[in-house]
């Protein structure tokens, strides 16, 4: 018979390892994207990052981040995004709602979108790791 498994209790070191990996991969992506010269960041795009009303790691907007990165993957064949997505999926609940992204059509605007989101993703992973470690410190004091 079909019985749902018990709710998975993940050790915090596993979650920290996932976010550390994402932080490292986000730097790799940004370095790769920044090689394209003459592209400026845009104020038109905002990557959702951390939610103030949830505890780490559920405060990371993983489904939305995944959708944005999937869009970049479709616009520009960055293989590092495959690995990023696999790690984000470790943080995404299987019933999480889908996020729709409106994709720029102009080639130069696409490049601005990729740079802007990649930069915000890198900053977001720095924040996520900080929120995790500060949360862990609070839990032990």
């Amino acid at each position: 018979s079909h019985t749902l498994p018990v709710r998975l209790l993940r050790p915090s070191d596993d979650v920290q390892k996932i976010v550390e990996e994402l932080q490292s991969l986000s730097k790799m992506l940004l370095k790769d994207v920044e090689e394209e010269k003459g592209v400026l960041v845009s104020q038109n795009y905002t990557l959702p990052c951390l939610s103030p009303d949830a505890q780490p790691p559920n405060n990371i907007h993983s489904p939305a981040i995944r959708a944005y990165l999937k869009t970049i993957r479709q616009l520009d064949n960055k293989s590092v995004i495959d690995e990023i997505i696999e790690h984000l999926d470790k943080l995404i609940f299987q019933d999480a709602p889908e996020t729709n992204i409106s994709v720029p059509t102009d080639t130069h605007e696409c490049k601005r979108f990729i740079l802007t989101i990649s930069q915000q993703f890198s900053e977001c992973m720095d924040l996520a790791l900080k929120s995790l470690t500060s949360g862990a410190q609070q839990a032990t004091t």
Epitope: L8, R10, P11, D14, K70, D89, F93, Q94, D95
Partner: antibody, heavy 122, light 107 residues
Framework: QVQLVQSGAEVKKPGSSVKVSCKAS????????MQWVRQAPGQGLEWMGA????????RYSQKFKGRVTITADKSTSTAYMELSSLRSEDTAVYYC???????????????WGQGTTVTVSS | AIQMTQSPSSLSASVGDRVTITCRAS??????LAWYQQKPGKVPKLLIY???TSASGVPSRFSGSRSGTDYTLTISSLQPEDVATYYC?????????FGGGTKVEIK
């Protein structure tokens, strides 16, 4: 109750292709990765690749890259694995497997198809 | 690719014996490891997921543990129906490779 039903046994000539199907019923998840695994006679389990059916996103083992194509039809809850340029060493039982759990990423494959025997012989 | 080194490749033990099978990952994979049992001519069956969580309906004599990059499947009291080949598989990042398998027989 989750059930995975695979297509029947196939006998193929070297150089040809085979397409194995895996139909899921009773499976309600939307965000998940499923995998294809094969087992040659008397050998261990070998990972071939995976698909995220909701988006058609795929990952392949380096060993099979260029020869294997994994696809999914959301409307019929069916996944497919096509292997081309068959050789005698591809004679094996091919399995599809699906995870259960609360996250999009798997941490174990709870459900397995019954296996499809593919024999490659001239 | 992450390598999973499983040992021993085969073992023979008596009914009631405690049996341990080990998988070593070539790098840190957290708890993203599963154990399967495959009886001759049958489909693999999930025993343990997330390194130490038992799958539904699995007898309590089967347990999983982790120490760093070493993962252990323990059968606390071997039964005749446990004759099978056991495999580990990691899920840290693709390719999700398997260990080479451990064939368990009764003395």
């Amino acid at each position: 109750q989750v059930q995975l039903v695979q297509s029947g046994a196939e006998v193929k000539k070297p150089g040809s292709s085979v397409k194995v199907s895996c139909k899921a019923s009773g499976y309600t998840r939307t965000r998940y990765w499923m995998q294809w695994v094969r087992q040659a006679p008397g050998q261990g389990l070998e990972w071939m690749g995976a698909i995220y059916p909701g988006e058609g996103d795929t990952r392949y083992s380096q060993k099979f890259k260029g020869r294997v194509t994994i696809t999914a039809d959301k409307s019929t809850s069916t996944a497919y694995m096509e292997l081309s340029s068959l050789r005698s060493e591809d004679t094996a039982v091919y399995y599809c497997a699906f995870p259960e759990g609360q996250y999009a990423a798997p941490y174990g494959m709870h459900y397995w198809g019954q296996g499809t025997t593919v024999t490659v012989s001239s | 690719a992450i390598q999973m080194t499983q040992s021993p490749s085969s073992l023979s033990a008596s009914v009631g014996d405690r049996v341990t099978i080990t998988c070593r990952a070539s790098r840190n994979i957290g708890n993203y490891l599963a154990w399967y049992q495959q009886k001759p001519g049958k489909v693999p069956k999930l025993l343990i997921y997330y390194a130490k969580t038992s799958a539904s309906g699995v007898p309590s004599r089967f347990s999983g543990s982790r120490s760093g990059t070493d993962y252990t499947l323990t059968i606390s009291s071997l039964q005749p129906e446990d004759v099978a080949t056991y495999y580990c598989q990691h899920f840290w990042k693709t390719p999700w490779t398997f260990g080479g398998g451990t064939k368990v027989e009764i003395k």
